[in-house]
Amino acid sequence: QPEQKTLSLTGTYRHVDRTTGQVLTCDKCPAGTYVSEHCTNTSLRVCSSCPSGTFTRHENGIERCHDCSQPCPRPMIERLPCAALTDRECICPPGMYQSNGTCAPHTVCPVGWGVRKKGTENEDVRCKQCARGTFSDVPSSVMKCRAHTDCLGQNLMVVKQGTKETDNVCGVHLSSSSTTPSSPGIATFSHPEHTESHDVPSSTYEPQGMNSTDSNSTASVRTKVPSDIQEETVPDNTSSTSGKESTNRTLPNPPQLTHQQGPHHRHILKLLPSSMEATGEKSSTAIKAPKRGHPRQNPHKHFDINEH
């Protein structure tokens, strides 16, 4: 329906009347419409709604609406549909982010690493090494490092010290025994730490999503764990959450985590972050068997103060 009311419009535009050559000042049409007929000395301009597939965002004096952008290319999805007032807006679906004009999967932080910063549709996930007292036993693009179960807090003993990749394993406390096998001494930043965990060489592997390099690689798979990494079994009593499982094992062709390496993924010194990371204190169960994800090398540790 052509609109001629101008009460709510304050903007004007100049138009040259082709028949008289006179320069006229006409009222603009509102957003979502266009000027189907310019004003004359004796009549107001006429506004018409934008046809399907076109739009105008602002009040205007144009003779045709703008064409909407092309349909979203897969795997993008529409954030905003093409409508009279808005152009079509495409975004990457959940679990992906826009990189170099396309969508790339969020980095998957490997075992021993956790999410330092959540990914968005425009930014990749940033990973961080699990710090002392925390662990991550599954590759994930959404999970943070979690604090080791506090066995002592449940009046249980530590049957097996946790590492950056495994939780503590708690066992029934023998009341007759005053010793708590490798009981986690102190925790550095929040849950029972694995104080006597093994310092497993975690090779220099870093999930790309953790790199601070400003590369905008859009590869769909990242975070590879070197297949030649061997874990040491030398206990590093100094680091409570630094190691991996104490059993020696050579990582078999480590599964490749799909993840985008972005300049993001910093988990460094998370203020002494690694352990400082998750806030979600995990509820511990009386007896917890370590979850075993793919044997992943235990990468590096960072000041991780982030919590869940």
Epitope: R132, L271, L272, M276, H300, K301, N306
Partner: antibody, heavy 115, light 110 residues
């Protein structure tokens, strides 16, 4: 026994440069994130910079960004902090710390920036 | 000024219980683990508590940490003269994307 030993501190004029080193021993250096934390005379602790175990990622406090560079040589078990364009406010004892939890600290090295 | 707020000082007599608070926000303490460090006069800081409430081996059980919401606290029971030191809380700050320390609390044993 985990040991971290800083060196390289000293007196330097404003605008000058210094390179701090932190020699690590007693643990597998290449497995850990390392950080620098400083403490101005009579003041509290201030995080300065961190670096991943492989050196692939670094992080800096806004106050030193663009002036300081953290690096590491895993073959030498050594952490470095290159400090350029030093200012009077950079005067402090600089500590290197291990892991995201900063579970071990060196004894510190004093950097004095004064004319 | 620090993102984490600690009282500048705290004191107690031997045997007493002293608590130090550390107040932050959702972007730091509220969503991350808290760490506590002890710095004895003239020495380097030492990790005292990690992941909110865990003690590294060698740290007496007189020291305990806790966290609730956007605040954390360090409790020292059975205060001893050797506990006289500066205590710092620390955590990660999601907004700053950096670690942050509290201003420190000087504990004096009267």
């Amino acid at each position: 026994e985990v040991q971290l030993l800083e060196s390289g501190g000293g007196l330097v004029q404003p605008g000058g440069s210094l390179r701090l080193s932190c020699a690590a021993s007693g643990f597998t250096f290449s497995n850990y994130e390392m950080s620098w934390v400083r403490q101005a005379p009579g003041k509290g602790l201030e995080w300065v910079s961190s670096i991943y175990s492989s050196g692939g990622e670094t992080l800096y406090a806004d106050s030193v960004k663009g002036r300081f560079t953290i690096s590491r040589d895993n073959s030498k078990n050594t952490l470095y902090l290159q400090m350029n364009s030093l200012r009077a406010e950079d005067t402090a004892v600089y500590y290197c710390a291990r892991d995201g939890a900063a579970d071990y600290w060196g004894q510190g090295t004093l950097v004095t920036v004064s004319s | 000024q620090s993102e984490l707020t600690q009282p500048p000082s705290a004191s107690g007599t031997p045997g007493q219980w002293v608590t130090i608070s550390c107040s932050g926000s959702t972007s730091n303490i509220g969503n991350n683990y808290v760490y506590w460090y002890q710095q004895l006069p003239g020495t380097a800081p030492k990790l005292l508590i990690y992941t909110n409430n865990q003690r590294p081996s060698g740290v007496p059980d007189r020291f305990s940490g806790s966290k609730s919401g956007t605040s954390a606290s360090l409790a020292i029971s059975g205060l001893r003269s050797e506990d006289e030191a500066d205590y710092y809380c620390a955590t990660w700050d999601d907004s700053l994307y950096a670690p942050v320390f509290g201003g420190g609390t000087k504990v004096t044993v009267l």
